[in-house]
Structures are given as C-alpha cells and as structure tokens.
C-alpha cells in the first residue's frame, strides 16, 4: 500500500470528511477526471488539481497534528505527478506563485503573451515536429 | 497572422509593457517552457500559465479600453489550448474556481484525495493501459 493512503485516512478524520454526505452535490475532481482519457488532457486537469492540493496544504502548514500526513502526501504527489523530478516540481511551484496583481508580473506576462500563445498548440511545440508534419502531409499528398 | 497578435500588441501599449526593461530579471513563462519538450510536461506547465492569464484578464474585465483585446485573446486561447472544446474549457474553469478556504470544498477534496492520487501516475490512467504494460513486461521476461 502506498504511504499516502494511511495519511489520507488521517486527514479524512481531521477534516471530518469520511461521511457519505460529503459526496453530496457531486464531486470536485473525480467526475472531471473521468471525462478525459487522453494523457495530455488529463495533465491539463491534473495540473490544476495538484496546485489546488498544494494551496490547501499551505493553508494548514502550521497545524502540527496533520503536519506529518501533509508532508507524506506532498512527497508522494511529487513522486507520482512529477516523477521525483525536482526541476519539474520547482518550475511548477514558480508558476503557481506568481501574483496576478503585481504590476511587474502583469507587465512581464503581457510582454511574453505573443510567444506563449504561439506555443500553446501542440503543433507549435518544436520546429522539428512541424517539419515532420509537413513531410507527412507531403508524403500523403504524393500517394 | 493570428487575431491575437494585434490585440496583444494593444495590451502591451496599455500595460506599458513594450520596453526592453520589462524583460529585466528573467522571464515568467518562456524560460520554463523551454525546459520541457515532452508534451505531457508542457501541458502541466501550460495549464498553470493559461490559468494565470485567465485570472489576469478577470482582474481587468471591466476595463473598457482593453475589453475587445482581452476577449479576442481569450477566444484564441480557447481555440489553441482547448481545441475549441467547450467541455474541456468548462471543466478547466471549474477547477480554477474552487476556493481552498471553503470548508465544504476542503472536505470534498480530502474525501477524494486517495482516488485522485491513485490516478496521478500516467500508468494508473486506465486498467487497459495497466494490462498492456503487464503483458509487455511478461513478454520481455520470457524473451
């Protein structure tokens, strides 16, 4: 059994979240995750879900009674979602910590917007990928 | 030229973000995007970046002088990042709008935590995928 399971059960007790009535009015995350099978779509959704949990855990960081549980779960998220890749986790954290009301940040975000947009479509990812698509189209056209 | 380019230039003027000094102290997003080539890693990062822009645009939603630019860019993000898939965009918006301080939301999140964690690793995505991996391992072992 993964270490997070026991600690998540501990959090359930703490938050009084074991009762069936907690599930009233639908789910937060599970229903949405069920909608998306494609790996890249799932990553889009899971990215928001993981950042939600990190924010939630930050809220309770001074709470000694659940400190160990929170740390264990965060560590396990790190293994599962970031493949224990510290750089990936750090970049992610950086992105979640930018403030939308800081004028310096606002300006930088707008300054970078055109380039960010150009990279949003999977096709735009790399020149290499674009080239291979062109070749593929060319091949199809000549068949 | 994509419609967002002209509108992004308009935003640059509004935010006074065209000057080269805006780029001082590194980039917000571009440097991070450069670090990740793998599509699923890029989606993890882009998910946070897109939600940042949506929050930023929300902050300026009543601002008449940039209303049209913001709407055009949001629409173009919708096309590029969500493939014009309304359901995908709606699910994403839902996730970004959950409040980490709402007790009901906290409880639901903790209630769903074990199942969310179980789905975080790509390998855990579907039973089908797990099975095919087991078969593959079995094949390799018997070679």
């Amino acid at each position: 059994q993964d270490p997070y399971v026991k600690e998540a059960e501990n959090l359930k007790k703490y938050f009084n979240a074991g009762h069936s009535d907690v599930a009233d009015n639908g789910t937060l995350f599970l229903g949405i995750l069920k909608n998306w099978k494609e790996e890249s779509d799932r990553k889009i959704m899971q990215s928001q879900i993981v950042s939600f949990y990190f924010k939630l855990f930050k809220n309770f960081k001074d709470d000694q009674s659940i400190q160990k549980s929170v740390e264990t779960i965060k560590e396990d998220m790190n293994v599962k979602f970031f493949n224990s890749n510290k750089k990936k986790r750090d970049d992610f954290e950086k992105l979640t910590n930018y403030s939308v009301t800081d004028l310096n940040v606002q300006r930088k975000a707008i300054h970078e917007l055109i380039q960010v947009m150009a990279e949003l479509s999977p096709a735009a990812k790399t020149g290499k990928r674009k080239r291979s698509q062109m070749l593929f189209r060319g091949r199809r056209a000549s068949q | 030229q994509d419609p967002y380019v002209k509108e992004a230039e308009n935003l640059k003027k509004y935010f006074n973000a065209g000057h080269s000094d805006v780029a001082d102290n590194g980039t917000l997003f571009l440097g991070i995007l450069k670090n990740w080539k793998e599509e699923s890693d890029r989606k993890i990062m882009q998910s946070q970046i897109v939600s940042f822009y949506f929050k930023l645009f929300k902050n300026f939603k009543d601002d008449q002088s940039i209303q049209k630019s913001v709407e055009t860019i949001k629409e173009d993000m919708n096309v590029k990042f969500f493939n014009s898939n309304k359901k995908k965009r709606d699910d994403f918006e839902k996730l970004t709008n959950y409040s980490v301080t709402d007790l009901n939301v906290q409880r639901k999140a903790i209630h769903e935590l074990i199942q969310v964690m179980a789905e975080l690793s790509p390998a855990a995505k579907t039973g089908k995928r797990k099975r095919s991996q087991m078969l593959f391992r079995g094949r390799r072992a018997s070679q």
Epitope: T101, L103, Q106 | K13, Y14, F15, N16, N59, F60, K61, D62, D63, S65
Partner: nanobody, 124 residues
C-alpha cells in the same frame, strides 16, 4: 477641475494596519484611474497602487503586493488604500492621484491631479 482629499495617515507599530481614504469632488472622476503614490524623505515619489473607478484593474508595486489593497466606493466617490503588515520602510507621505485610464503608468509626471498627501509613520 478635480479636487482630491486624502486622509487616514498616522503613526503605527510595525505589523499594524492603517486605512487611507481619498475623496474626490469636481469633474467626473470616473474618467480617470486612481493611483496611490508615496514619497519617503530624500527619495523620489514612487507608485504604490492603481485601480479603476469600477473597482477592477488592480495593480500594485511589488513591494506592497499582498499587503495593501486598493478599493473604491462609487456612492461616496472615495478610494481606499488598506495597508496591512506595515513595515518601517513603508514610512512616507502617501498621495492620492488621478491617472490616465487608457494606460497603466507608474510615472508620477503623468498624473493629472494630486491630493495634498497624508503622513504614514511605521515605528519598529
């Protein structure tokens, strides 16, 4: 002509809070964005925060973001600057300002109208 009356300054301990007010009268103030600037002794006047009269489009200087909150009350034609977790380096004269609404500027030379200023002193 627009008149701006700022008030609410005072002396407070580090970690404390103050709320500054800026009451506007005269010409339609809604044509402008509202900003707060501050000037510490021997320093240049610097941008603190900006907001539109609609209550949207908030921007803050990096040094105060997360501690200060700017808001508007249209009925009273007043803009507020709520300052929390004050630090000694926040000590300055704070000025309310009418700014262009079609660009976000931190340049005090582009301000149309100024309030008379209110002193904020944060002691350690």
């Amino acid at each position: 002509q627009v008149q701006l009356q700022d008030s609410g300054g005072g002396t407070v301990q580090a970690g404390g809070s103050l709320r500054l007010s800026c009451a506007a009268s005269g010409r339609t103030f809604s044509d402008y964005a509202v900003g707060w600037f501050r000037q510490a002794p021997g320093k240049e006047r610097e941008f603190v925060a900006r907001i539109l009269w609609t209550g949207a489009s908030r921007s803050y200087a990096n040094s105060v973001d997360g501690r200060f909150t700017v808001s508007t009350d249209n009925a009273k034609n007043t803009v507020y600057l709520q300052m929390n977790s004050l630090k000694p380096e926040d000590t300055a004269i704070y000025y309310c300002a009418a700014l262009p609404s079609n660009i976000i500027t931190t340049d005090y030379l582009r301000v149309y109208y100024w309030g008379q200023g209110t002193q904020v002193t944060v002691s350690s």
